[in-house]
Protein backbone atom coordinates (compact mmCIF):
# COMPACT_ATOMS: atom_id res chain seq x y z
CA UNK A 1 0.00 0.00 0.00
CA UNK A 2 1.16 3.53 -0.70
CA UNK A 3 2.34 5.28 2.43
CA UNK A 4 0.42 8.49 2.95
CA UNK A 5 2.73 11.42 3.59
CA UNK A 6 1.85 14.60 5.39
CA UNK A 7 3.03 18.15 5.01
CA UNK A 8 2.88 20.06 8.25
CA UNK A 9 1.86 23.71 8.51
CA UNK A 10 2.25 25.47 11.84
CA UNK A 11 0.34 28.74 11.87
CA UNK A 12 -1.09 31.18 14.37
CA UNK A 13 -4.68 32.21 14.93
CA UNK A 14 -5.81 34.82 12.44
CA UNK A 15 -3.34 33.75 9.77
CA UNK A 16 -4.13 32.13 6.43
CA UNK A 17 -3.35 28.62 5.29
CA UNK A 18 -2.45 28.75 1.60
CA UNK A 19 -1.71 25.40 -0.05
CA UNK A 20 -1.57 24.02 -3.57
CA UNK A 21 -2.70 20.54 -4.55
CA UNK A 22 -1.51 19.43 -7.97
CA UNK A 23 -3.25 16.99 -10.27
CA UNK A 24 -2.88 15.45 -13.70
CA UNK A 25 -4.27 18.30 -15.75
CA UNK A 26 -5.12 16.25 -18.84
CA UNK A 27 -7.28 13.92 -16.76
CA UNK A 28 -8.87 16.14 -14.17
CA UNK A 29 -8.85 19.75 -15.39
CA UNK A 30 -12.61 20.27 -15.29
CA UNK A 31 -13.41 17.66 -12.64
CA UNK A 32 -15.00 18.78 -9.43
CA UNK A 33 -12.52 19.04 -6.58
CA UNK A 34 -12.95 19.21 -2.83
CA UNK A 35 -11.20 20.01 0.43
CA UNK A 36 -11.78 17.52 3.20
CA UNK A 37 -10.94 17.11 6.86
CA UNK A 38 -10.04 13.68 8.21
CA UNK A 39 -10.78 12.99 11.85
CA UNK A 40 -9.55 9.94 13.71
CA UNK A 41 -11.95 7.05 13.37
CA UNK A 42 -14.16 8.90 10.91
CA UNK A 43 -14.57 9.06 7.16
CA UNK A 44 -13.32 12.22 5.42
CA UNK A 45 -15.73 15.14 5.64
CA UNK A 46 -16.03 17.56 2.72
CA UNK A 47 -15.79 21.19 3.78
CA UNK A 48 -15.88 22.84 0.37
CA UNK A 49 -15.85 21.88 -3.28
CA UNK A 50 -15.48 23.54 -6.65
CA UNK A 51 -18.34 23.83 -9.07
CA UNK A 52 -19.18 21.09 -11.52
CA UNK A 53 -17.61 21.38 -13.97
CA UNK A 54 -14.85 23.22 -12.17
CA UNK A 55 -14.35 26.76 -13.48
CA UNK A 56 -10.87 27.98 -14.32
CA UNK A 57 -9.40 30.24 -11.59
CA UNK A 58 -12.88 31.26 -10.41
CA UNK A 59 -12.93 31.35 -6.59
CA UNK A 60 -15.49 29.35 -4.67
CA UNK A 61 -15.85 30.39 -1.05
CA UNK A 62 -17.54 28.43 1.70
CA UNK A 63 -17.22 30.27 4.98
CA UNK A 64 -13.50 30.80 5.56
CA UNK A 65 -12.42 28.32 2.89
CA UNK A 66 -11.61 29.51 -0.62
CA UNK A 67 -10.88 27.16 -3.53
CA UNK A 68 -9.38 28.22 -6.85
CA UNK A 69 -8.81 25.67 -9.61
CA UNK A 70 -6.15 26.58 -12.18
CA UNK A 71 -6.87 24.18 -15.03
CA UNK A 72 -3.95 25.02 -17.29
CA UNK A 73 -1.43 24.30 -14.55
CA UNK A 74 -3.20 21.38 -12.93
CA UNK A 75 -3.41 22.89 -9.48
CA UNK A 76 -6.05 23.50 -6.89
CA UNK A 77 -5.27 26.37 -4.54
CA UNK A 78 -6.87 26.06 -1.11
CA UNK A 79 -6.94 28.92 1.35
CA UNK A 80 -8.36 28.93 4.86
CA UNK A 81 -8.49 32.48 6.17
CA UNK A 82 -8.64 33.79 9.73
CA UNK A 83 -7.52 30.47 11.18
CA UNK A 84 -8.76 29.33 14.58
CA UNK A 85 -7.14 26.86 16.97
CA UNK A 86 -10.10 24.55 16.32
CA UNK A 87 -9.09 24.33 12.65
CA UNK A 88 -6.12 22.16 13.61
CA UNK A 89 -6.33 18.76 12.00
CA UNK A 90 -5.56 16.62 8.98
CA UNK A 91 -6.80 17.75 5.56
CA UNK A 92 -6.69 16.52 2.00
CA UNK A 93 -7.64 17.57 -1.52
CA UNK A 94 -9.67 15.11 -3.57
CA UNK A 95 -11.07 14.93 -7.06
CA UNK A 96 -14.64 13.78 -7.47
CA UNK A 97 -15.04 11.27 -10.28
CA UNK A 98 -18.45 9.62 -9.92
CA UNK A 99 -19.39 6.85 -9.98
CA UNK A 100 -15.85 6.00 -8.84
CA UNK A 101 -14.55 6.96 -5.42
CA UNK A 102 -12.86 10.34 -4.97
CA UNK A 103 -9.24 10.45 -6.05
CA UNK A 104 -6.95 11.73 -3.30
CA UNK A 105 -4.24 14.24 -4.14
CA UNK A 106 -0.98 13.94 -2.24
CA UNK A 107 0.19 15.16 0.23
CA UNK A 108 -2.18 15.39 3.12
CA UNK A 109 -1.93 18.60 5.10
CA UNK A 110 -1.38 18.50 8.84
CA UNK A 111 -2.50 21.91 10.10
CA UNK A 112 -1.53 23.02 13.58
CA UNK A 113 -2.98 26.36 14.64
CA UNK A 114 -1.71 27.89 17.87
CA UNK A 115 -2.78 30.90 19.90
CA UNK A 116 -0.82 33.97 18.94
CA UNK A 117 -0.91 37.67 18.41
CA UNK A 118 -2.50 38.01 14.98
CA UNK A 119 -1.21 41.58 14.68
CA UNK A 120 2.39 40.59 15.32
CA UNK A 121 4.42 38.32 13.04
CA UNK A 122 5.94 35.23 14.56
CA UNK A 123 9.68 34.76 14.73
CA UNK A 124 9.89 33.15 11.32
CA UNK A 125 6.70 34.47 9.80
CA UNK A 126 5.81 37.38 7.63
CA UNK A 127 3.33 40.11 8.43
CA UNK A 128 2.16 40.62 4.89
CA UNK A 129 -1.59 40.95 4.92
CA UNK A 130 -2.86 44.50 5.14
CA UNK A 131 -6.50 44.14 4.23
CA UNK A 132 -8.92 41.27 4.52
CA UNK A 133 -12.60 42.00 4.16
CA UNK A 134 -14.98 39.06 4.40
CA UNK A 135 -17.17 39.30 1.29
CA UNK A 136 -20.87 39.78 2.01
CA UNK A 137 -21.81 36.64 0.11
CA UNK A 138 -20.15 33.31 -0.48
CA UNK A 139 -20.46 30.88 -3.34
CA UNK A 140 -21.55 27.46 -2.19
CA UNK A 141 -21.11 24.69 -4.69
CA UNK A 142 -23.07 21.50 -4.16
CA UNK A 143 -20.82 18.62 -3.23
CA UNK A 144 -21.92 15.09 -4.06
CA UNK A 145 -22.45 12.57 -1.31
CA UNK A 146 -20.48 9.34 -1.38
CA UNK A 147 -21.38 6.36 0.68
CA UNK A 148 -18.80 3.80 -0.34
CA UNK A 149 -17.33 1.59 2.40
CA UNK A 150 -13.96 3.29 2.21
CA UNK A 151 -14.82 6.91 1.63
CA UNK A 152 -17.71 8.98 2.83
CA UNK A 153 -17.94 12.69 2.19
CA UNK A 154 -20.65 15.11 3.11
CA UNK A 155 -22.06 18.33 1.77
CA UNK A 156 -20.50 21.46 3.28
CA UNK A 157 -22.08 22.62 6.51
CA UNK A 158 -24.24 25.74 6.56
CA UNK A 159 -21.84 27.33 9.02
CA UNK A 160 -18.11 26.88 9.38
CA UNK A 161 -18.41 26.82 13.16
CA UNK A 162 -18.30 23.02 13.23
CA UNK A 163 -16.07 22.60 10.23
CA UNK A 164 -12.84 22.08 12.03
CA UNK A 165 -13.19 20.72 15.50
CA UNK A 166 -9.78 19.16 16.17
CA UNK A 167 -9.15 15.63 17.19
CA UNK A 168 -8.67 15.38 20.94
CA UNK A 169 -5.08 14.41 20.26
CA UNK A 170 -3.05 15.30 17.19
CA UNK A 171 -0.95 12.35 16.12
CA UNK A 172 2.24 13.47 14.40
CA UNK A 173 4.07 10.17 14.39
CA UNK A 174 3.96 9.59 10.64
CA UNK A 175 4.88 13.05 9.42
CA UNK A 176 7.50 12.54 6.74
CA UNK A 177 7.91 16.05 5.40
CA UNK A 178 7.76 19.04 7.69
CA UNK A 179 7.88 22.42 6.00
CA UNK A 180 7.46 25.76 7.74
CA UNK A 181 6.20 28.35 5.32
CA UNK A 182 5.89 32.13 5.53
CA UNK A 183 2.25 32.94 5.87
CA UNK A 184 -0.30 35.69 5.66
CA UNK A 185 -0.65 37.45 8.98
Amino acid sequence: ATKLTEEKYELKEGQTLDVKCDYTLEKFASSQKAWQIIRDGEMPKTLACTERPSKNSHPVQVGRIILEDYHDHGLLRVRMVNLQVEDSGLYQCVIYQPPKEPHMLFDRIRLVVTKGFSGTPGSNENSTQNVYKIPPTTTKALCPLYTSPRTVTQAPPKSTADVSTPDSEINLTNVTDIIRVPVFN
Partner: antibody, heavy 117, light 107 residues
Framework: EVQLVESGGGLVQPGGSLRLSCAAS????????MSWVRQAPGKGLEWVAN????????YYVDSVKGRFTISRDNAKNSLYLQMNSLRAEDTAVYYC??????????WGQGTLVTVSS | DIQMTQSPSSVSASVGDRVTITCRAS??????LAWYQQKPGRAPKLLIY???RLQSGVPSRFSGSGSGTDFTLTISSLRPEDFATYYC?????????FGQGTKVEIK
Protein backbone atom coordinates in the same frame (compact mmCIF):
# COMPACT_ATOMS: atom_id res chain seq x y z
CA GLU B 1 -4.86 37.69 -26.79
CA VAL B 2 -4.07 38.67 -23.20
CA GLN B 3 -2.83 42.23 -22.91
CA LEU B 4 -1.78 44.33 -19.93
CA VAL B 5 -0.90 47.98 -20.48
CA GLU B 6 0.51 50.11 -17.68
CA SER B 7 0.44 53.90 -17.50
CA GLY B 8 0.95 56.69 -15.02
CA GLY B 9 4.70 56.49 -14.43
CA GLY B 10 6.92 59.54 -14.42
CA LEU B 11 9.27 61.74 -12.41
CA VAL B 12 8.19 62.65 -8.89
CA GLN B 13 9.92 64.26 -5.93
CA PRO B 14 10.59 62.35 -2.71
CA GLY B 15 7.49 62.43 -0.55
CA GLY B 16 5.28 62.85 -3.59
CA SER B 17 2.49 60.65 -4.95
CA LEU B 18 1.73 58.84 -8.16
CA ARG B 19 -1.05 56.58 -9.35
CA LEU B 20 -0.31 53.77 -11.76
CA SER B 21 -2.96 52.13 -13.90
CA CYS B 22 -3.06 48.86 -15.76
CA ALA B 23 -5.64 48.21 -18.48
CA ALA B 24 -6.37 44.51 -18.99
CA SER B 25 -7.93 42.82 -21.99
CA UNK B 26 -8.21 39.40 -23.60
CA UNK B 27 -9.26 37.51 -20.47
CA UNK B 28 -11.88 37.55 -17.73
CA UNK B 29 -10.19 40.11 -15.51
CA UNK B 30 -12.54 39.55 -12.56
CA UNK B 31 -11.50 35.87 -12.30
CA UNK B 32 -7.84 36.47 -11.48
CA UNK B 33 -5.63 37.74 -8.72
CA MET B 34 -3.51 40.61 -10.04
CA SER B 35 -0.11 41.87 -8.92
CA TRP B 36 2.35 44.69 -9.24
CA VAL B 37 6.00 43.67 -9.59
CA ARG B 38 8.84 46.17 -9.78
CA GLN B 39 12.42 46.23 -10.98
CA ALA B 40 14.90 48.89 -9.90
CA PRO B 41 17.38 49.98 -12.60
CA GLY B 42 19.93 47.22 -13.16
CA LYS B 43 18.43 45.12 -10.36
CA GLY B 44 16.23 42.06 -9.99
CA LEU B 45 12.49 41.58 -9.76
CA GLU B 46 10.48 42.26 -6.61
CA TRP B 47 6.82 41.51 -5.99
CA VAL B 48 5.12 44.62 -4.56
CA ALA B 49 1.44 43.91 -3.99
CA ASN B 50 -1.48 41.78 -5.09
CA UNK B 51 -5.24 41.83 -4.88
CA UNK B 52 -7.90 39.14 -4.88
CA UNK B 53 -10.44 38.75 -7.69
CA UNK B 54 -13.18 40.69 -5.91
CA UNK B 55 -10.86 43.16 -4.20
CA UNK B 56 -11.60 41.72 -0.75
CA UNK B 57 -7.95 40.98 0.05
CA UNK B 58 -4.80 43.00 -0.54
CA TYR B 59 -1.23 42.07 0.31
CA TYR B 60 1.96 44.13 0.26
CA VAL B 61 5.69 43.71 0.59
CA ASP B 62 6.86 45.14 3.91
CA SER B 63 8.77 48.03 2.36
CA VAL B 64 5.64 49.64 0.86
CA LYS B 65 3.08 48.90 3.57
CA GLY B 66 1.17 51.96 4.64
CA ARG B 67 2.40 53.92 1.61
CA PHE B 68 1.06 52.00 -1.39
CA THR B 69 -2.52 50.90 -2.03
CA ILE B 70 -3.52 48.38 -4.68
CA SER B 71 -7.07 48.45 -6.01
CA ARG B 72 -9.09 47.27 -8.97
CA ASP B 73 -12.20 48.13 -10.94
CA ASN B 74 -13.56 44.96 -12.50
CA ALA B 75 -16.17 46.88 -14.46
CA LYS B 76 -13.34 48.76 -16.19
CA ASN B 77 -10.92 45.80 -16.34
CA SER B 78 -8.38 47.98 -14.57
CA LEU B 79 -5.79 47.57 -11.85
CA TYR B 80 -4.31 50.48 -9.90
CA LEU B 81 -1.42 51.25 -7.59
CA GLN B 82 -1.63 54.43 -5.53
CA MET B 83 1.87 55.31 -4.35
CA ASN B 84 2.27 57.89 -1.59
CA SER B 85 5.27 59.12 0.40
CA LEU B 86 7.55 58.01 -2.40
CA ARG B 87 11.22 57.40 -1.70
CA ALA B 88 14.29 57.24 -3.92
CA GLU B 89 14.38 53.47 -3.41
CA ASP B 90 10.94 53.18 -5.04
CA THR B 91 12.52 54.16 -8.36
CA ALA B 92 11.83 51.24 -10.68
CA VAL B 93 9.94 49.94 -13.65
CA TYR B 94 6.55 48.81 -12.35
CA TYR B 95 4.92 45.85 -14.07
CA CYS B 96 1.32 44.77 -13.85
CA UNK B 97 1.08 40.96 -13.87
CA UNK B 98 -1.63 38.34 -13.77
CA UNK B 99 -1.35 35.72 -11.03
CA UNK B 100 -2.10 32.23 -12.22
CA UNK B 101 -1.98 30.04 -9.14
CA UNK B 102 1.76 29.42 -9.11
CA UNK B 103 3.17 31.98 -11.54
CA UNK B 104 2.84 35.45 -12.98
CA UNK B 105 1.88 34.27 -16.44
CA UNK B 106 1.26 37.55 -18.27
CA TRP B 107 3.04 40.86 -17.78
CA GLY B 108 2.58 44.37 -19.08
CA GLN B 109 5.41 46.29 -20.75
CA GLY B 110 6.08 48.26 -17.57
CA THR B 111 6.00 51.93 -16.61
CA LEU B 112 9.01 53.77 -15.17
CA VAL B 113 8.69 55.59 -11.87
CA THR B 114 11.58 57.89 -10.99
CA VAL B 115 11.75 59.42 -7.53
CA SER B 116 14.29 62.21 -7.47
CA SER B 117 14.67 65.80 -6.38
CA ASP C 1 10.35 35.04 3.52
CA ILE C 2 11.75 32.21 1.45
CA GLN C 3 15.10 33.23 -0.04
CA MET C 4 15.99 32.14 -3.56
CA THR C 5 19.66 31.91 -4.47
CA GLN C 6 20.62 31.64 -8.12
CA SER C 7 23.98 30.58 -9.46
CA PRO C 8 25.99 31.57 -11.27
CA SER C 9 25.22 35.29 -11.34
CA SER C 10 26.49 35.38 -14.90
CA VAL C 11 27.72 32.91 -17.46
CA SER C 12 29.56 33.41 -20.74
CA ALA C 13 28.63 30.94 -23.43
CA SER C 14 28.64 30.42 -27.17
CA VAL C 15 25.87 29.54 -29.57
CA GLY C 16 25.30 25.79 -29.40
CA ASP C 17 26.53 25.48 -25.82
CA ARG C 18 24.61 23.71 -23.11
CA VAL C 19 23.87 26.11 -20.27
CA THR C 20 22.74 25.17 -16.77
CA ILE C 21 21.44 27.62 -14.17
CA THR C 22 20.57 26.57 -10.64
CA CYS C 23 18.23 27.99 -8.04
CA ARG C 24 18.23 27.02 -4.38
CA ALA C 25 15.41 27.76 -1.94
CA SER C 26 16.06 28.49 1.73
CA UNK C 27 13.39 25.92 2.60
CA UNK C 28 11.40 23.25 0.78
CA UNK C 29 9.03 24.60 -1.86
CA UNK C 30 7.92 21.26 -3.31
CA UNK C 31 7.68 21.86 -7.07
CA UNK C 32 6.36 25.42 -7.01
CA LEU C 33 9.14 27.07 -8.96
CA ALA C 34 9.04 28.96 -12.25
CA TRP C 35 11.72 30.26 -14.61
CA TYR C 36 11.58 33.53 -16.55
CA GLN C 37 13.64 35.06 -19.33
CA GLN C 38 14.09 38.81 -19.53
CA LYS C 39 15.72 40.82 -22.25
CA PRO C 40 16.80 44.46 -21.77
CA GLY C 41 13.87 46.86 -21.82
CA ARG C 42 11.36 44.03 -21.95
CA ALA C 43 9.01 42.37 -19.49
CA PRO C 44 9.91 38.93 -18.12
CA LYS C 45 8.63 35.97 -20.14
CA LEU C 46 7.49 32.74 -18.48
CA LEU C 47 9.47 29.71 -19.65
CA ILE C 48 8.89 26.93 -17.10
CA TYR C 49 6.35 26.47 -14.33
CA UNK C 50 5.85 23.81 -11.65
CA UNK C 51 9.63 23.15 -11.87
CA UNK C 52 9.52 21.22 -15.13
CA ARG C 53 6.46 22.07 -17.20
CA LEU C 54 7.17 23.98 -20.38
CA GLN C 55 4.99 27.03 -20.95
CA SER C 56 3.07 26.95 -24.20
CA GLY C 57 5.06 28.37 -27.10
CA VAL C 58 8.45 28.02 -25.40
CA PRO C 59 11.07 26.07 -27.42
CA SER C 60 11.84 22.56 -26.19
CA ARG C 61 15.54 23.36 -25.78
CA PHE C 62 14.49 24.86 -22.44
CA SER C 63 13.89 22.38 -19.65
CA GLY C 64 13.55 22.49 -15.89
CA SER C 65 14.05 19.97 -13.13
CA GLY C 66 14.19 19.65 -9.38
CA SER C 67 11.94 19.67 -6.34
CA GLY C 68 12.21 20.61 -2.70
CA THR C 69 15.09 23.06 -2.47
CA ASP C 70 17.24 22.54 -5.57
CA PHE C 71 16.17 23.39 -9.10
CA THR C 72 17.82 23.62 -12.50
CA LEU C 73 17.08 25.39 -15.76
CA THR C 74 18.87 23.91 -18.77
CA ILE C 75 19.21 25.33 -22.25
CA SER C 76 20.31 22.34 -24.30
CA SER C 77 21.75 24.23 -27.26
CA LEU C 78 22.06 27.99 -26.91
CA ARG C 79 20.59 30.13 -29.69
CA PRO C 80 21.43 33.81 -30.36
CA GLU C 81 18.02 34.88 -29.04
CA ASP C 82 18.66 33.13 -25.71
CA PHE C 83 21.20 35.67 -24.49
CA ALA C 84 19.26 37.32 -21.67
CA THR C 85 18.83 37.34 -17.91
CA TYR C 86 17.01 34.43 -16.28
CA TYR C 87 15.11 34.53 -12.99
CA CYS C 88 13.58 31.85 -10.82
CA UNK C 89 10.41 32.47 -8.81
CA UNK C 90 9.10 30.45 -5.87
CA UNK C 91 5.34 30.34 -5.36
CA UNK C 92 5.12 27.99 -2.39
CA UNK C 93 5.44 30.42 0.50
CA UNK C 94 3.97 33.88 0.60
CA UNK C 95 5.25 36.36 -0.45
CA UNK C 96 6.41 34.92 -3.75
CA UNK C 97 10.10 35.68 -4.18
CA PHE C 98 12.52 35.82 -7.10
CA GLY C 99 16.11 34.77 -7.42
CA GLN C 100 18.61 37.56 -8.07
CA GLY C 101 19.01 36.60 -11.73
CA THR C 102 21.58 34.96 -13.98
CA LYS C 103 22.86 36.84 -17.00
CA VAL C 104 23.74 34.66 -19.98
CA GLU C 105 26.29 36.57 -22.07
CA ILE C 106 28.01 35.95 -25.37
CA LYS C 107 31.51 34.55 -24.97
Amino acid sequence: EVQLVESGGGLVQPGGSLRLSCAASGFTFSSYWMSWVRQAPGKGLEWVANIKQDGSEEYYVDSVKGRFTISRDNAKNSLYLQMNSLRAEDTAVYYCARDYGDVFDYWGQGTLVTVSS
Amino acid sequence: DIQMTQSPSSVSASVGDRVTITCRASQGIRKWLAWYQQKPGRAPKLLIYAASRLQSGVPSRFSGSGSGTDFTLTISSLRPEDFATYYCLQAHGFPWTFGQGTKVEIK
